[in-house]
Interface confidence: low
């Protein structure tokens, strides 16, 4: 399977909400011994590999934001976590996987990475990630709503496997 990032750049005004999205592509095994772990973290554009550095999002670690389930099942993080930190990660039955960030501030600007790990229990693991940039703007040049810029097809299906 692959992870696609439909948009590589999100430009948003301060105070707005944004939903960053990744999409799981390709065949997904729904066997009982296969689990998918999905999470989000902040990173920086590394010299060798994007998303190699893993930093918290608004002080929440990947462990706080992760989802786990089999196949294309739906899941989301606990509601009070989302309310307290203005964050919620979710996935649907179609392989879409997102994090919603509320009331954006300039400090939220940066590179965001989604990570999906497929674990075949006791046998193997396969991990892929996607990256996108969030720019939060203020002042007269800021857009009134979030503007999204589609990824090139090459970027959107860029994968990193274990």
């Amino acid at each position: 399977f692959k992870v696609a990032t439909p948009y590589s750049l999100y430009v948003c005004p301060e105070g707005q909400n944004v939903t960053l999205t990744c999409r799981l592509l390709g065949p997904v095994d729904k066997g009982h011994d296969v689990t998918f772990y999905k999470t989000w973290y902040r990173s920086s554009r590394g010299e060798v590999q994007t998303c190699s550095e893993r930093r918290p999002i608004r002080n929440l670690t990947f462990q706080d934001l992760h989802l786990h389930h089999g196949g294309h099942q739906a899941a989301n993080t606990s509601h009070d976590l989302a309310q307290r930190h203005g964050l919620e990660s979710a996935s649907d039955h179609h392989g879409n996987f997102s994090i919603t960030m509320r009331n954006l501030t300039l400090l939220d600007s940066g590179l965001y990475c989604c990570l999906v790990v497929e674990i075949r229990h006791h046998h193997s693991e396969h991990r892929v990630h996607g990256a996108m940039e969030l720019q939060v703007q203020t002042g007269k040049d800021a857009p009134s709503n979030c503007v999204v810029y589609p990824s090139s097809s090459q970027d959107s299906e860029n994968i990193t496997a274990a």
Epitope: T35, Y37, T39, R54, T61, F62, Q63, D64, H66, H68, S78, D80, L81, V117, I119, H121, H122, H123, S124, E125, R127, A162
Partner: antibody, heavy 120, light 107 residues
């Protein structure tokens, strides 16, 4: 079958550090959260922190923040817990524990425990 | 942090008795609650995960129930090998926290 094998008992002086290892065998290592749980004599269980090796960064309980370091070496499937500035109340059995459900924290695999005694 | 409170802290029972241990979380943890059994000098053993799922290899006399903040571990008919200390543990979020334990002793 997954097995977690810990290093042997340690006797340490107050103010020093101890590093306990936990070697995993019988399954994949990188994607599973490994936690460290300690138990002082006659007391209950206390979670110190955990690490998911593929991320390489650990998550610590506030009580131990700044004094504990949890690391993992994917090449040897070994997790480590280092506790510094030891005091007598750190005398305890230290367990590593793991789940078979990946990044979850229900612990169905445990090491045999490592007794750390802090005494002057 | 989520506080876990177990009751009673100890109890005396006879072989064949039905035993109930309760665990209360300081806030909702959905069903992210596990139960462990520990015998002296041994590592804990997982009995129940996700509040009510029986861990593989654990006898069916052990059962768990509850969701939100209130949970129960029941041993339907106490056996000699069940005399031990039992702990609840939440894994809804880190830091992971345990109850203080319930020691089940022979009457």
């Amino acid at each position: 079958q997954v097995q977690l094998v810990q290093s042997g008992a340690e006797v340490k002086k107050p103010g020093s550090s101890v590093k306990v290892s936990c070697k995993a065998s019988g399954g994949t290592f990188s994607s599973y959260a490994i936690s460290w749980v300690r138990q002082a004599p006659g007391q209950g269980l206390e979670w110190m922190g955990g690490i998911i090796p593929i991320f390489g960064t650990a998550n610590y309980a506030q009580k131990f923040q700044g004094r504990v370091t949890i690391t993992a070496d994917e090449s040897t499937s070994t997790a480590y817990m280092e506790l510094s500035s030891l005091r007598s109340e750190d005398t305890a059995v230290y367990y590593c524990a793991r789940s078979s459900y990946g990044w979850s924290y229900e612990f169905d695999y445990w090491g045999q425990g490592t007794l750390v005694t802090v005494s002057s | 942090d989520i506080q876990m409170t177990q009751s009673p802290s100890s109890l005396s029972a006879s072989v064949g008795d039905r035993v109930t241990i309760t665990c209360r979380a300081s806030q909702s943890i959905r069903t992210d609650l596990n139960w462990y059994q520990q015998k002296p000098g041994k590592a804990p053993k997982l009995l129940i995960y996700s509040a009510s799922s029986l861990q593989s290899g654990v006898p069916s006399r052990f059962s768990g129930s509850g969701s939100g903040t209130d949970f129960t571990l029941t041993i339907s008919s106490l056996q000699p090998e069940d005399f031990a200390t039992y702990y609840c543990q939440q894994n809804e979020r880190t830091p992971i926290t345990f109850g203080q334990g319930t020691k089940v002793e022979i009457k």
